[in-house]
């Protein structure tokens, strides 16, 4: 149950300008998850550019089961996780662990969800209860977004946290534990 598979399946994304995701459900986000800063690699010499279209980031494919209470999806769903720093396309490796790593020193960019898709899932429940259907919104593509001066420090933290983990649903956890970490496409930082 939970994370069934992780495919280290990176795709380079060269995003378009001026596209924004649909406003997400208004729930809070606890910003407590850790992430690896810069992948542990030393920063490459910064490359200054004003054009977001010159930047790219990776899409990682995750396969997981979704749940609701005691019920679990009959089949796993596959979604994207927007991962890593945004860097000039020509410097960003196309697969993890290969090539040079770049870290911006000037404008601040983040790899964030761009488009979402809704997937209808069938959940199987214990005790002979009828299966139930749900619609989960999954990240369909990622993009680099340049942070403006209007984004404050807490919003910068949101970007970092969100970029490093799945966008919907998590491994089932004890009932009363915080679900805030589930709410990944949240806040208006996007």
């Amino acid at each position: 149950q939970g994370w069934q598979a992780f495919k280290n399946d990176a795709t380079e994304i060269i995003p378009e300008l001026g596209e924004y995701p649909e406003p997400p459900p208004e729930l809070e986000n606890n910003k407590t998850m850790n992430r690896a800063e810069n992948g542990g690699r030393p920063p490459h010499h910064p490359f200054e550019t004003k054009d977001v279209s010159e930047y790219s980031c990776r899409e990682l494919h995750f396969t997981r089961y979704v749940t609701d209470g005691p019920c679990r999806s009959a089949k796993p769903v596959t979604e994207l996780v927007c991962s890593g720093q945004c860097g000039p396309a020509r410097l960003l490796p196309n697969a993890i662990g290969r090539g040079k790593w770049w870290r911006p020193s000037g404008p601040d960019f983040r790899c964030i969800p761009d488009r979402y898709r809704a997937q209808r899932v069938q959940l199987l429940c214990p005790g002979g209860e009828a299966p139930r259907a749900r619609k989960v919104r999954l990240v369909a593509s990622c993009k680099c977004k340049r942070l403006t001066r209007f984004h404050n420090q807490s919003e910068l933290k949101d970007f970092g946290t969100e970029a490093a983990r799945p966008q919907k649903g998590r491994k089932p956890r004890p009932r009363a534990r915080s679900a805030k970490a589930n709410q990944a496409e949240l806040e208006n930082a996007y």
Epitope: R64, T67, D68, R120, K135, K168, R170, A179
Partner: antibody, heavy 121, light 106 residues
Framework: EVQLVQSGAEVKKPGASVKVSCKAS????????IHWVRQAPGQGLEWIGR????????EFAPKFPGKVTMTTDTSISTAYMELSRLRSDDTAVYYC??????????????WGQGTLVTVSS | DIQLTQSPSFLSASVGDRVTITCRAS?????IHWYQQKPGKAPKLLIY???NLASGVPSRFSGSGSGTEFTLTISSLQPEDFATYYC?????????FGGGTKVEIK
């Protein structure tokens, strides 16, 4: 901005039917289930059922099949709930709400403003 | 069906009071949500998945519980908190709401 805007109040006679609308904006209605909940005067909330705007499939609370018809017109992002054979105890405020599901939990962050249906002879 | 019983049904309290509302389920459930409703308005999501604050909800609201007993706590009641509160479950079909707790000014 996500919004659900419902049609105005209705006064109907017993035995008649009424159709309440719920217009969605700020999101694609096909991506979410739309639920209907009612509240009789001075009473609590009662779930009626839900509709999948993408394919028209419906689910009802046990007491409502045959009484309620839920439909959608995705071309105008609107969900409808029709109540037939109205009785005085159908007098209530009817709400639509959007079901959100994150892969672990299901909840209703967005609600319409409500439509008062009064059944009186 | 899972019945949700809220207690008390009515509660008189003063500004600044600590208020606790209980929601008991007739069978064990995984989580509940809490909604606040003011007269003439639609319900507003307050706490989701037992213990998580919805956006824009003040931190004086908190939720806890598991199994068959869940609580909503308002640590210091404010004038705008006088309203009716509902719990809701969908761990088991059909979806059900509690009967509501009306918080009135003492």
């Amino acid at each position: 901005e996500v919004q659900l805007v419902q049609s105005g109040a209705e006064v109907k006679k017993p035995g008649a039917s009424v159709k309440v609308s719920c217009k969605a904006s700020g999101f694609d209605i096909k991506d979410y289930y739309i639920h209907w909940v009612r509240q009789a005067p001075g009473q609590g909330l009662e779930w009626i059922g839900r509709v999948d705007p993408d394919n028209g499939e419906t689910e009802f609370a046990p007491k409502f099949p045959g009484k309620v018809t839920m439909t959608t017109d995705t071309s105008i992002s609107t969900a409808y709930m029709e109540l037939s054979r109205l009785r005085s105890d159908d007098t209530a405020v009817y709400y639509c709400a959007r079901e959100d599901y994150d892969g672990t939990y299901t909840w209703f962050p967005y609600w319409g403003q409500g439509t008062l249906v009064t059944v009186s002879s | 069906d899972i019945q949700l019983t809220q207690s008390p049904s009515f509660l008189s309290a003063s500004v600044g009071d600590r208020v606790t509302i209980t929601c008991r389920a007739s069978s064990s459930i995984s989580y509940i949500h809490w909604y606040q409703q003011k007269p003439g308005k639609a319900p507003k999501l307050l706490i989701y998945a037992t213990s998580n604050l919805a956006s824009g909800v003040p931190s004086r609201f908190s939720g806890s519980g598991s199994g068959t007993e869940f609580t909503l706590t308002i640590s210091s009641l404010q004038p705008e908190d006088f309203a009716t509160y509902y719990c809701q479950q969908w761990s088991s079909d059909p979806l059900t709401f509690g009967g509501g707790t009306k918080v009135e000014i003492k």
